[in-house]
Protein backbone atom coordinates (compact mmCIF):
# COMPACT_ATOMS: atom_id res chain seq x y z
CA UNK A 1 0.00 0.00 0.00
CA UNK A 2 1.17 3.73 -0.08
CA UNK A 3 2.65 5.34 2.56
CA UNK A 4 -0.14 8.33 2.55
CA UNK A 5 -1.71 7.44 5.52
CA UNK A 6 0.79 5.73 7.04
CA UNK A 7 2.72 7.87 8.91
CA UNK A 8 1.84 7.07 11.95
CA UNK A 9 4.56 6.10 14.34
CA UNK A 10 3.59 2.72 15.38
CA UNK A 11 3.97 2.24 11.55
CA UNK A 12 6.75 3.77 10.49
CA UNK A 13 8.35 1.15 13.16
CA UNK A 14 6.13 -1.74 11.78
CA UNK A 15 7.49 -0.58 8.62
CA UNK A 16 11.14 -0.66 10.30
CA UNK A 17 11.29 -3.66 12.10
CA UNK A 18 9.46 -5.54 8.90
CA UNK A 19 12.62 -4.30 6.92
CA UNK A 20 14.70 -5.14 8.99
CA UNK A 21 13.13 -8.81 8.85
CA UNK A 22 12.72 -9.49 5.83
CA UNK A 23 17.00 -8.55 5.08
CA UNK A 24 17.93 -10.41 8.36
CA UNK A 25 15.69 -13.58 6.05
CA UNK A 26 17.41 -12.52 2.44
CA UNK A 27 21.02 -12.02 4.02
CA UNK A 28 20.82 -15.59 6.21
CA UNK A 29 19.66 -17.11 2.94
CA UNK A 30 22.47 -15.64 0.77
CA UNK A 31 24.96 -16.51 3.42
CA UNK A 32 23.90 -20.16 3.88
CA UNK A 33 24.12 -20.80 0.15
CA UNK A 34 27.56 -19.48 -0.07
CA UNK A 35 28.46 -22.19 2.34
CA UNK A 36 26.66 -24.74 1.01
CA UNK A 37 28.47 -23.90 -2.29
CA UNK A 38 31.95 -23.72 -0.58
CA UNK B 1 0.30 -20.05 23.45
CA UNK B 2 -1.83 -18.18 25.77
CA UNK B 3 -2.46 -14.50 27.55
CA UNK B 4 -3.65 -13.79 30.47
CA UNK B 5 -4.65 -10.96 32.64
CA UNK B 6 -4.55 -10.86 36.24
CA UNK B 7 -5.25 -8.04 39.19
CA UNK B 8 -8.69 -6.74 38.52
CA UNK B 9 -10.42 -5.74 41.24
CA UNK B 10 -13.35 -3.31 43.09
CA UNK B 11 -12.14 -0.25 43.68
CA UNK B 12 -12.86 3.48 44.60
CA UNK B 13 -12.33 6.42 42.82
CA UNK B 14 -8.72 7.36 42.62
CA UNK B 15 -7.99 4.57 43.84
CA UNK B 16 -4.29 3.25 41.86
CA UNK B 17 -4.54 -0.11 40.37
CA UNK B 18 -1.96 -2.30 37.96
CA UNK B 19 -2.99 -5.22 36.19
CA UNK B 20 -0.65 -8.09 34.83
CA UNK B 21 -0.66 -9.61 31.51
CA UNK B 22 1.11 -12.96 31.13
CA UNK B 23 2.28 -14.74 28.28
CA UNK B 24 3.09 -18.46 28.22
CA UNK B 25 4.45 -20.42 24.87
CA UNK B 26 5.61 -17.14 23.22
CA UNK B 27 8.80 -14.59 24.70
CA UNK B 28 7.82 -10.68 24.36
CA UNK B 29 11.54 -9.91 22.80
CA UNK B 30 9.59 -11.51 19.85
CA UNK B 31 6.15 -9.85 20.17
CA UNK B 32 4.48 -6.53 20.55
CA UNK B 33 1.65 -6.46 22.82
CA UNK B 34 -1.55 -4.62 23.70
CA UNK B 35 -4.32 -3.80 26.21
CA UNK B 36 -7.78 -3.06 25.06
CA UNK B 37 -10.76 -2.67 27.13
CA UNK B 38 -14.81 -3.17 27.03
CA UNK B 39 -17.40 -1.65 29.10
CA UNK B 40 -20.04 -3.66 30.10
CA UNK B 41 -22.87 -4.05 27.11
CA UNK B 42 -20.34 -1.42 24.79
CA UNK B 43 -17.97 -2.04 22.45
CA UNK B 44 -13.81 -2.42 22.56
CA UNK B 45 -11.73 0.50 22.99
CA UNK B 46 -8.11 0.34 22.79
CA UNK B 47 -5.72 1.56 25.73
CA UNK B 48 -2.13 1.32 24.29
CA UNK B 49 0.80 -0.64 22.91
CA UNK B 50 4.42 -1.91 24.23
CA UNK B 51 6.50 -3.39 21.29
CA UNK B 52 9.41 -5.67 21.59
CA UNK B 53 11.84 -2.59 22.62
CA UNK B 54 9.49 -1.24 25.45
CA UNK B 55 8.74 2.27 23.28
CA UNK B 56 5.02 2.63 24.34
CA UNK B 57 1.54 4.32 22.01
CA UNK B 58 -1.48 5.24 23.72
CA UNK B 59 -5.35 6.25 22.73
CA UNK B 60 -5.92 10.08 22.57
CA UNK B 61 -7.80 9.77 26.10
CA UNK B 62 -5.22 7.99 27.96
CA UNK B 63 -3.93 11.43 28.80
CA UNK B 64 -1.46 9.85 30.89
CA UNK B 65 -3.16 8.34 33.42
CA UNK B 66 -2.72 4.76 32.26
CA UNK B 67 1.21 3.34 31.59
CA UNK B 68 2.09 0.05 30.07
CA UNK B 69 5.30 -1.28 30.63
CA UNK B 70 7.04 -4.72 30.64
CA UNK B 71 8.17 -6.49 34.08
CA UNK B 72 9.95 -9.29 33.17
CA UNK B 73 10.38 -11.34 29.94
CA UNK B 74 6.58 -12.67 30.46
CA UNK B 75 4.65 -10.42 31.83
CA UNK B 76 3.04 -6.88 31.04
CA UNK B 77 1.82 -4.68 33.48
CA UNK B 78 -1.15 -2.05 33.15
CA UNK B 79 -0.59 0.87 35.89
CA UNK B 80 -4.11 2.81 36.00
CA UNK B 81 -4.59 5.66 37.97
CA UNK B 82 -7.14 8.78 38.73
CA UNK B 83 -9.46 5.92 38.18
CA UNK B 84 -13.66 6.97 37.91
CA UNK B 85 -16.63 5.15 37.24
CA UNK B 86 -16.17 5.43 33.87
CA UNK B 87 -12.90 3.06 33.79
CA UNK B 88 -15.20 0.38 34.73
CA UNK B 89 -14.79 -2.47 31.83
CA UNK B 90 -13.22 -5.57 31.56
CA UNK B 91 -9.71 -5.39 30.60
CA UNK B 92 -8.05 -7.86 27.76
CA UNK B 93 -4.66 -8.39 26.68
CA UNK B 94 -4.06 -9.11 23.28
CA UNK B 95 -0.89 -10.24 21.22
CA UNK B 96 0.25 -8.16 17.81
CA UNK B 97 0.74 -9.65 14.54
CA UNK B 98 3.79 -9.96 12.85
CA UNK B 99 5.11 -6.82 10.88
CA UNK B 100 5.80 -7.91 7.10
CA UNK B 101 7.20 -5.63 4.30
CA UNK B 102 4.19 -5.68 2.18
CA UNK B 103 1.90 -5.63 5.63
CA UNK B 104 3.07 -3.95 8.89
CA UNK B 105 -0.41 -3.25 9.52
CA UNK B 106 -1.37 -4.10 13.19
CA UNK B 107 -3.88 -6.72 14.14
CA UNK B 108 -4.96 -8.50 17.51
CA UNK B 109 -4.54 -11.84 16.78
CA UNK B 110 -3.81 -13.41 20.79
CA UNK B 111 -6.52 -12.70 22.85
CA UNK B 112 -6.57 -13.23 26.91
CA UNK B 113 -9.63 -13.88 29.05
CA UNK B 114 -9.83 -10.67 30.09
CA UNK B 115 -9.94 -9.42 34.09
CA UNK B 116 -12.68 -7.48 35.53
CA UNK B 117 -12.24 -4.17 37.07
CA UNK B 118 -15.20 -2.23 38.91
CA UNK B 119 -14.53 1.35 40.13
CA UNK B 120 -17.50 2.37 42.42
CA UNK B 121 -17.79 4.43 45.53
CA UNK C 1 -8.92 11.95 13.50
CA UNK C 2 -9.25 8.87 12.00
CA UNK C 3 -12.97 7.00 12.70
CA UNK C 4 -14.41 3.62 11.74
CA UNK C 5 -18.37 3.72 11.71
CA UNK C 6 -20.01 0.37 11.69
CA UNK C 7 -23.35 -0.31 10.07
CA UNK C 8 -26.19 -1.62 10.84
CA UNK C 9 -25.92 -2.27 14.90
CA UNK C 10 -27.87 -5.17 15.04
CA UNK C 11 -29.44 -7.10 12.63
CA UNK C 12 -31.10 -10.74 12.53
CA UNK C 13 -30.98 -13.79 9.62
CA UNK C 14 -32.03 -16.35 9.55
CA UNK C 15 -30.42 -19.84 9.55
CA UNK C 16 -29.05 -20.55 6.36
CA UNK C 17 -29.29 -16.76 5.35
CA UNK C 18 -26.54 -14.12 4.79
CA UNK C 19 -25.34 -11.83 6.92
CA UNK C 20 -23.81 -8.17 5.61
CA UNK C 21 -21.67 -5.80 7.47
CA UNK C 22 -20.15 -2.55 6.57
CA UNK C 23 -17.70 -1.24 7.92
CA UNK C 24 -16.71 3.01 7.20
CA UNK C 25 -13.35 4.38 7.56
CA UNK C 26 -12.88 7.98 7.71
CA UNK C 27 -9.94 8.16 5.59
CA UNK C 28 -8.08 5.81 3.22
CA UNK C 29 -6.40 3.01 5.31
CA UNK C 30 -6.08 0.68 1.77
CA UNK C 31 -6.25 -3.00 2.72
CA UNK C 32 -5.48 -2.66 6.54
CA UNK C 33 -8.29 -4.12 7.81
CA UNK C 34 -9.23 -6.66 10.16
CA UNK C 35 -12.70 -8.13 11.55
CA UNK C 36 -13.29 -10.20 14.55
CA UNK C 37 -15.81 -12.25 16.03
CA UNK C 38 -17.49 -11.92 19.86
CA UNK C 39 -19.71 -14.24 22.00
CA UNK C 40 -20.60 -13.28 25.03
CA UNK C 41 -18.21 -13.51 28.40
CA UNK C 42 -15.35 -14.69 25.76
CA UNK C 43 -12.74 -12.53 24.25
CA UNK C 44 -12.92 -11.20 20.41
CA UNK C 45 -11.53 -13.41 17.97
CA UNK C 46 -9.90 -12.70 14.53
CA UNK C 47 -11.61 -13.70 11.69
CA UNK C 48 -10.05 -11.85 9.08
CA UNK C 49 -7.04 -9.49 7.95
CA UNK C 50 -5.44 -7.92 5.52
CA UNK C 51 -9.77 -6.65 4.46
CA UNK C 52 -9.51 -10.08 2.60
CA UNK C 53 -7.22 -13.01 4.16
CA UNK C 54 -8.99 -15.40 6.84
CA UNK C 55 -7.15 -16.20 10.05
CA UNK C 56 -6.30 -19.83 10.71
CA UNK C 57 -8.97 -22.13 11.22
CA UNK C 58 -11.79 -19.44 10.32
CA UNK C 59 -14.68 -20.90 8.24
CA UNK C 60 -15.12 -19.65 4.91
CA UNK C 61 -18.51 -18.65 5.21
CA UNK C 62 -17.02 -15.53 6.51
CA UNK C 63 -15.89 -13.70 3.74
CA UNK C 64 -14.05 -9.69 3.91
CA UNK C 65 -13.68 -7.32 1.15
CA UNK C 66 -12.97 -4.07 0.23
CA UNK C 67 -10.20 -1.39 0.12
CA UNK C 68 -9.77 2.26 0.72
CA UNK C 69 -12.69 3.23 2.83
CA UNK C 70 -15.16 1.20 2.31
CA UNK C 71 -15.44 -2.83 3.93
CA UNK C 72 -17.66 -5.34 3.83
CA UNK C 73 -18.34 -9.00 6.40
CA UNK C 74 -20.67 -11.19 4.77
CA UNK C 75 -21.42 -14.35 6.59
CA UNK C 76 -23.08 -16.93 4.07
CA UNK C 77 -24.63 -19.70 5.17
CA UNK C 78 -25.51 -18.45 8.84
CA UNK C 79 -25.85 -20.97 11.76
CA UNK C 80 -26.57 -20.56 15.10
CA UNK C 81 -22.98 -20.70 16.23
CA UNK C 82 -22.44 -17.14 14.33
CA UNK C 83 -25.26 -15.28 16.76
CA UNK C 84 -22.18 -13.04 18.06
CA UNK C 85 -21.07 -9.18 18.00
CA UNK C 86 -18.62 -8.71 15.07
CA UNK C 87 -16.05 -5.58 14.98
CA UNK C 88 -13.89 -4.00 12.47
CA UNK C 89 -10.45 -2.54 12.85
CA UNK C 90 -8.35 0.16 10.99
CA UNK C 91 -4.45 -1.49 11.61
CA UNK C 92 -2.88 1.59 10.14
CA UNK C 93 -2.05 3.57 12.91
CA UNK C 94 -2.04 3.30 16.85
CA UNK C 95 -0.79 6.11 17.94
CA UNK C 96 -2.48 9.06 19.58
CA UNK C 97 -5.37 7.63 17.85
CA UNK C 98 -9.31 7.66 19.11
CA UNK C 99 -10.33 4.43 18.77
CA UNK C 100 -9.56 1.76 16.02
CA UNK C 101 -12.36 0.10 16.09
CA UNK C 102 -15.63 -0.06 15.13
CA UNK C 103 -18.42 0.41 16.99
CA UNK C 104 -19.76 -3.56 16.79
CA UNK C 105 -23.13 -5.30 15.21
CA UNK C 106 -24.64 -7.92 16.84
CA UNK C 107 -25.99 -10.24 14.75
CA UNK C 108 -28.78 -12.54 16.05
CA UNK C 109 -29.49 -15.92 14.30
CA UNK C 110 -33.43 -16.60 14.43
Known amino acids: HSDGIFTDSYSRYRKQMAVKKYLAAVLGKRYKQRVKNK | QSVEESGGRLVTPGTPLTLTCTVS????????MSWVRQAPGKGLEYIGI??????TWYASWVKGRFTISKTSSTTVDLKMTSLTTEDTATYFC?????????????????WGQGTLVTVSS | ALVMTQTPSSVSAAVGGTVTINCLASQNIYNSLAWYQQKPGQPPKLLIY???TLASGVSSRFKGSGSGTQFTLTISGVECADAATYYC????????????FGGGTEVVVK
Open chain 2, 25 to 32: GFSLSSYD
Open chain 3, 89 to 100: QQGAGADNIGNP
Open chain 2, 50 to 55: INTNDD
Open chain 3, 50 to 52: RAS
Open chain 2, 94 to 110: ARISDAYVFDYAYYFTL
